[in-house]
C-alpha cells in the first residue's frame, strides 16, 4: 500500500506488533521440532547474530536471520517458516545484503543446526520484546 512507511522506517509500536506475531510462530515451531527430534543436542558451532549492535534498544537483525530460515525451510514446517519469513521481511532494512547459508550435509548435524537456529531465534525475540517493553524507546 502507498500508505505504508518503508519497512526500515517502522516505529517501535509496529516493531512490537511484528514481534508479538513472531513469538507464537517461533515458539510453536521450536516445540514441534523438539517433540519430533528428541535427543538432538544444540550445536555449539552455530551462532545466530540476531541483534544489531548499532542501535539502542537492540533491533532484530532481520537480514542476518532471514538466510537461516530460507535455508531450513525445505527441512522444516514450510507453512510456519513462510509466515516467519513474511514477518521478518517487514523488519528488514531496504538494500541490506543477505548472505547465503548452507545447511550441514550430515543428517544429525543438520538436525542440530535447525534446533539451534530455532532456540536462538526464540531467545532473541524474547530479548527484543523485553527491550521494547522497558520504558521509553
Amino acid at each position: 500500500s502507498s500508505h505504508m512507511a518503508p519497512t526500515h522506517q517502522l516505529p517501535p509500536s509496529d516493531v512490537r506488533k511484528i514481534i508479538l506475531e513472531l513469538q507464537p510462530l517461533s515458539r510453536g515451531l521450536l516445540e514441534d521440532y523438539q517433540k519430533k527430534e528428541t535427543g538432538v543436542p544444540e550445536s555449539n558451532r552455530t551462532l545466530l547474530l540476531c541483534l544489531t549492535s548499532d542501535s539502542q534498544p537492540p533491533r532484530l537483525n532481520s537480514s542476518a536471520i532471514l538466510p537461516y530460515f530460507r535455508a531450513i525451510r525445505p527441512l522444516s514446517d514450510k507453512n510456519i517458516i513462510d509466515k516467519i519469513i513474511e514477518q521478518l521481511d517487514k523488519l528488514k532494512f531496504q538494500h541490506e545484503p543477505e548472505t547465503e547459508i548452507s545447511v550441514p550435509a550430515d543428517t544429525f548435524e543438520c538436525k542440530s543446526f535447525i534446533l539451534t537456529i530455532l532456540q536462538q531465534f526464540s531467545a532473541c525475540l524474547e530479548s527484543v520484546f523485553k527491550s521494547l517493553n522497558s520504558g521509553p524507546q
Epitope: 500500500s1 512507511a5 519497512t7 522506517q9 517502522l10 516505529p11 509500536s13 509496529d14 511484528i18 506475531e21
Partner: antibody, heavy 118, light 111 residues
C-alpha cells in the same frame, strides 16, 4: 467502503462486566489490526488495545488485568470485554481499523456510549 | 507513556481565515526521519475522520485546505481557509510507541 459499527449495553452496573461488539463490513478482520479506543466525558481519549489479523491481542498496561479482546471471524466481528467496571469506565467506546504498518487508524465506528451506574 | 499536549482547547476563527492547532509530544515521535503523529476530525454524532497521517500526509479525499507540519515533538495542523463545514473537534495522536496516546482536542468554532 469499510464500515465499523459498535453495539452493546448502554448501562452497566458497577462491579459488572461490559461487553461490546464491533461489526465490520467492507474488510476482513483476518487482515490488519482491530483496535478499541474510548473517550471519557470531557473528551480525553484512551487507547485500549487490539486484536490482530492472526488473533494476537495486546492491551494498554493500564487496563491489562481487566480487558479481553476476542473475535469471531465467521461473523467478521470483534469484541471488547471489560471486567470489574466502575463509574470511571463511563465513556464512548470506539472501534477502529489499523490496516498498514506505519500508517494510522483510517476507519472508525461512530462510537457507543456506556454509562456505569447503579 | 508519551504525553500529548494540544493547544488551544478551543479556537474561534472567521470564515476564510486560517486556523492553527498545535500538538506537542513529551518525547520525539520520529524514527528514521518519519514522524508518527496523526490528526483527525470529529463532528458531533459522527465517526472520527483521519485528515493527516505521519505529520504531513493528506489522507485521500481530504481537501487541500488541511495541512500538517512538524517533526520530533512539535506538530501543527493548519486549516486555510476555514469553511463553515470545518466546525468540529480536532485531535492529534501518536502511534510511535505503545500505548498510543492522544491530545486533549481542540474545538473549532466560527466567529
Amino acid at each position: 467502503e469499510v464500515q465499523l459499527v459498535e453495539s452493546g449495553p448502554s448501562l452497566v452496573k458497577p462491579g459488572g462486566s461490559l461487553r461490546l461488539t464491533c461489526s465490520v463490513t467492507g474488510d476482513s478482520i483476518t487482515s490488519g489490526y482491530w483496535k478499541w479506543i474510548r473517550k471519557f466525558p470531557g473528551n480525553k481519549l484512551e487507547y485500549m488495545g487490539y486484536i490482530s489479523y492472526s488473533g494476537i491481542t495486546d492491551y494498554n498496561p493500564s487496563l491489562k488485568s481487566r480487558i479481553t479482546i476476542s473475535r469471531d471471524t465467521s461473523k467478521n466481528q470483534y469484541y471488547l470485554q471489560l471486567n470489574s467496571v466502575t463509574t470511571e469506565d463511563t465513556a464512548t467506546y470506539y472501534c477502529a481499523r489499523y490496516a498498514n504498518y506505519g500508517y494510522a487508524m483510517d476507519y472508525w465506528g461512530q462510537g457507543t456510549s456506556v454509562t456505569v451506574s447503579s | 507513556d508519551i504525553v500529548m499536549t494540544q493547544s488551544p482547547a478551543s479556537l474561534s476563527v472567521s470564515l476564510g481565515q486560517r486556523a492553527t492547532i498545535s500538538c506537542r509530544a513529551s518525547e520525539s515521535v520520529d524514527t528514521y526521519g518519519r514522524s508518527f503523529m496523526h490528526w483527525y476530525q470529529q463532528k458531533p454524532g459522527q465517526s472520527p475522520k483521519l485528515l493527516i497521517y505521519r505529520a504531513s500526509n493528506l489522507e485521500s479525499g481530504i481537501p487541500a485546505r488541511f495541512g500538517g507540519s512538524g517533526s520530533g515533538t512539535d506538530f501543527t495542523l493548519t486549516i486555510d481557509p476555514v469553511q463553515a463545514d470545518d466546525v468540529a473537534t480536532y485531535y492529534c495522536y501518536q502511534s510511535y510507541e505503545d500505548p498510543w496516546t492522544f491530545g486533549g482536542g481542540t474545538k473549532l468554532e466560527i466567529k
